[in-house]
Amino acid sequence: SWMWNQFFLLEEYTGSDYQYVGKLHSDQDRGDGSLKYILSGDGAGDLFIINENTGDIQATKRLDREEKPVYILRAQAINRRTGRPVEPESEFIIKIHDINDNEPIFTKEVYTATVPEMSDVGTFVVQVTATDADDPTYGNSAKVVYSILQGQPYFSVESETGIIKTALLNMDRENREQYQVVIQAKDMGGQMGGLSGTTTVNITLTDVNDNPPRFPQSTYQFKTPESSPPGTPIGRIKASDADVGENAEIEYSITDGEGLDMFDVITDQETQEGIITVKKLLDFEKKKVYTLKVEASNPYVEPRFLYLGPFKDSATVRIVVEDVDEPPVFSKLAYILQIREDAQINTTIGSVTAQDPDAARNPVKYSVDRHTDMDRIFNIDSGNGSIFTSKLLDRETLLWHNITVIATEINNPKQSSRVPLYIKVLDVNDNAPEFAEFYETFVCEKAKADQLIQTLHAVDKDDPYSGHQFSFSLAPEAASGSNFTIQDNKDNTAGILTRKNGYNRHEMSTYLLPVVISDNDYPVQSSTGTVTVRVCACDHHGNMQSCHAEALIHPTGLSTGA
C-alpha cells in the first residue's frame, strides 16, 4: 500500500534549490530500482517533478497560494520491467501554505458617493470593501480593518464593515459641497507589520431645501406703453435661492396691490425669473401708475426646515403706464343709415362722430375712403362728420351701399381710424307694373262668349312695404265695342274673356288688346301692354288647327274693331 500523508508546501519559496515537497513510497518497493514512480495531474512534470526511482517530489517553481492553493496529483508505482502497477493509482493533495504576501485591495480605486446635506450624525454614506487574497482561514493575513486617513471630522468609518457615515452635524452644501475621504484597509487585524491599501472616496453633499428664495431688492419699477396688448411682457424679476435643482425652483404670484387685476406674473422655468405681463388693456388717461406685491416661493418645501422661517419672499413692483398717441375713436364700431331713393343731391343722411382719446383731444377731420365709393355717390363734411348724397340714388340698382369713413387727427395725420358705414336705400314707388311676359294668344272661330282665353300676370321693380296690388283694365280707347273683356281677378292676375259667339278669321285674323296695369302705391304708376289675339280654326275639342301667319297691325298698335 501507499505510504504518505497530505503534503504541505510554503508559498513564495525563495531558495536556490528546488523546494522539497515529500516522498511517494509504496511498501512494495524493495529499493532495488525495480519500481518506477509516475506523477500525473496538476503541474506534474512542470511544477512538480518526481525521482522515478525514489519517489521524491520537488517543486521546480515558486508557488503562489493566491493563484492556486491546492494541487491534486495522481501517483503510480509500476514494475519497471513488466509495466504492472504494484499499487492502484492514487490521488493525493499538495496544499500550499499561506504567508502574508498580499495587501488588501479595494474593489474600486475611487468611490463616488452622495449624502444629503444637513444629515444627522451617523447617516450612512457608502460602504467600501477591500479584499485580501491571503488565506482567510489561517492566521490574520486576510483579516482587514478599516480606518480613515483623511476626511475627519466630517466622516467616520466602521473598522469592521467599511461603512462610511457622517460625523459632523449640519454639514451645509451651500458652504462646502465636495469632500475627499481617504480610507485605509490594513490586514493582520490592523496590527503592526500588517499590509495596507487605500482608496479615495469622493463624497458630494446633495442639496436639500434649506434656503428660501430671496429678492435682491425690495422694489422694482417698470414702464409700459398704454398700447401694450394683454400678454405683453413688461419686465422680469428674479429671486435667488442658494439651493439647486427642484429645491431652487421658484413660483411667482401677485398677492396684493391695485394692479392685481391688470397684471399677471408667470414663471420662466428656464431662468427661474418672474415675468410681469399685461392682463387687461391699459389706459393712460384712466390710470398712470400701478403697484403690485409679488411673492416668490418654493413649490417644494421640506417640513423639517420650516423652523428656519417661511420659504418665500415678497417685493413691490411699481408699473408706470406711458402715454401713447392713439388714433381717433368712433362713437360706434359701425354705422347703419338709411335714405329714400328719391333723395335729392346734397341730402343729409346722418353723421359719424370720432374723438381723439388722448388728453390733448386733437381735432379730427373726416373723409370717405374712395376705394369703397368709386362712383362718389356720397360725401362727408370733413368738420362735423355729416354724410350727404352727391348723386341720385336708385334702390332698384343697388339696395345697400357699404362705404368706409376715415377719421384723421388734424395735427398728426398718421393717427387715423376707419369705421364701416352701411347705407340702406329705401323704396319709393317710381316704377310702373308691366306684363310678366309677352302675351300672344288665340281664339277659336267657334268660341262661345265669356270663354277665358288667357290669364295675365304683372311684375313691378318696386318693393312696397305692404306688397304689390295690381289692377287690370282695357285701355279707355279700346273699351267701347271691344270683342274681348278684361276680368281683374283681384289677386294680381287678370283674364281675357270672349265677348261674343264665334269669330271669322277671314274677316279679322288678329286682334290687338291694349291693357292698362296700375299699382296701388303712391304716386300711382301704370303702364299699357298689348296682347295679340289670333283667330284660328280649331277642332271640336278646341285645339288649334290653323291660323293666319301674321296679324294686321295698325301703326297705332290697336286693331280695328278690337
Epitope: G33, I78, N79, R80, R81, T82, G83, R84, P85, E89
Partner: antibody, heavy 117, light 111 residues
Framework: QVQLQQPGAELVKPGTSVKMSCKAS????????IAWVKQRPGQGLEWIGD????????HNNEKFNFKATLTVDTSSNTAYMQLSSLTSEDSAVYFC??????????WGQGTTLTVSS | DIVLTQSPASLAVSLGQRATISCRAS??????????MHWYQQKPGQPPKLLIY???NLESGVPARFSGSGSETDFTLNIHPVEEEDAATYFC?????????FGSGTKLEIK
C-alpha cells in the same frame, strides 16, 4: 537515439555452444532491462528471458532454463546470451529488445543462428 | 503460462477498408485499471515494431489509423483505413506475468 546492434548470423555445429552479443547505445544501459526473443522461421515469437544490467538480476522463461545464460558487460554496454548443447531446434533468429514497462519498444535487427553439421 | 490466441490466422482486406484482429488471453491481464497487452507489426526480414501499448495507447510515430481496445481477456487491434504498407504479420503480447508470451500472429494481406 536508442540503438541495439546484433551480428547478422552465426553458423555452429550441433552439440556446441554459441554466445551472441547485443550492443546498446543512446540511453543509460544500466537503467533498463534487456530481453531476448526467439523466432523460428515462419513461427511465432518466444520470450527467452531478460537481464537488468544495473544489478545483473535475470528473469528466465523456465523453458530455456538449461539452454540460455544471460550476462552483461557494463563497460562496453553489451548484453550476451549463451546457448548451449545446440541442436537443429535451436536454429532461429534471436532478437535482443528493450522491455520498457512490459512492452518491447526497441529491437535489434536479429542474429540468424544456423546449427548444422 | 498465459496463452494468447489470435484470430484469424490470416485475413485479406481491401484497400481503405477496416481490418480487425482479435487476441484472447487464457486469463485476465488487467490490474488496477492497467491492461498489460501490447501489439506489434512485423514485416519479413525485420524485427517486430511496437504499435500499441497497454491495450489502447498509440506508440509515438505510429499512424492514427491503428487503434487498440479491450480489457481483462479480450483485446482488439483495428486498422482503418487499411493501406498498402500495412501488409504484415501482427502479434499481441502480454506482460502481466512471467513468462511474457506472444500470440501466434495474424497475417494481413491487402486485396
Amino acid at each position: 537515439q536508442v540503438q541495439l546492434q546484433q551480428p547478422g548470423a552465426e553458423l555452429v555445429k550441433p552439440g556446441t555452444s554459441v554466445k551472441m552479443s547485443c550492443k546498446a547505445s543512446g540511453y543509460t544501459f544500466t537503467s533498463d532491462w534487456i530481453a531476448w526473443v526467439k523466432q523460428r522461421p515462419g513461427q511465432g515469437l518466444e520470450w527467452i528471458g531478460d537481464i537488468y544490467p544495473g544489478s545483473g538480476r535475470t528473469h528466465n522463461n523456465e523453458k530455456f532454463n538449461f539452454k540460455a545464460t544471460l550476462t552483461v558487460d557494463t563497460s562496453s554496454n553489451t548484453a550476451y546470451m549463451q546457448l548451449s548443447s545446440l541442436t537443429s531446434e535451436d536454429s532461429a533468429v534471436y532478437f535482443c529488445a528493450r522491455p520498457m514497462l512490459g512492452r518491447f519498444d526497441y529491437w535489434g535487427q536479429g542474429t540468424t543462428l544456423t546449427v548444422s553439421s | 503460462d498465459i496463452v494468447l490466441t489470435q484470430s484469424p490466422a490470416s485475413l485479406a482486406v481491401s484497400l481503405g477498408q477496416r481490418a480487425t484482429i482479435s487476441c484472447r488471453a487464457s486469463e485476465s491481464v488487467s490490474i488496477h485499471g492497467t491492461h498489460l497487452m501490447h501489439w506489434y507489426q512485423q514485416k519479413p526480414g525485420q524485427p517486430p515494431k511496437l504499435l500499441i501499448y497497454a491495450a489502447s495507447n498509440l506508440e509515438s510515430g505510429v499512424p492514427a489509423r491503428f487503434s487498440g481496445s479491450g480489457s481483462e481477456t479480450d483485446f482488439t487491434l483495428n486498422i482503418h483505413p487499411v493501406e498498402e504498407e500495412d501488409a504484415a504479420t501482427y502479434f499481441c503480447q502480454q506482460s502481466f506475468e512471467d513468462p511474457f508470451t506472444f500470440g501466434s500472429g495474424t497475417k494481413l494481406e491487402i486485396k
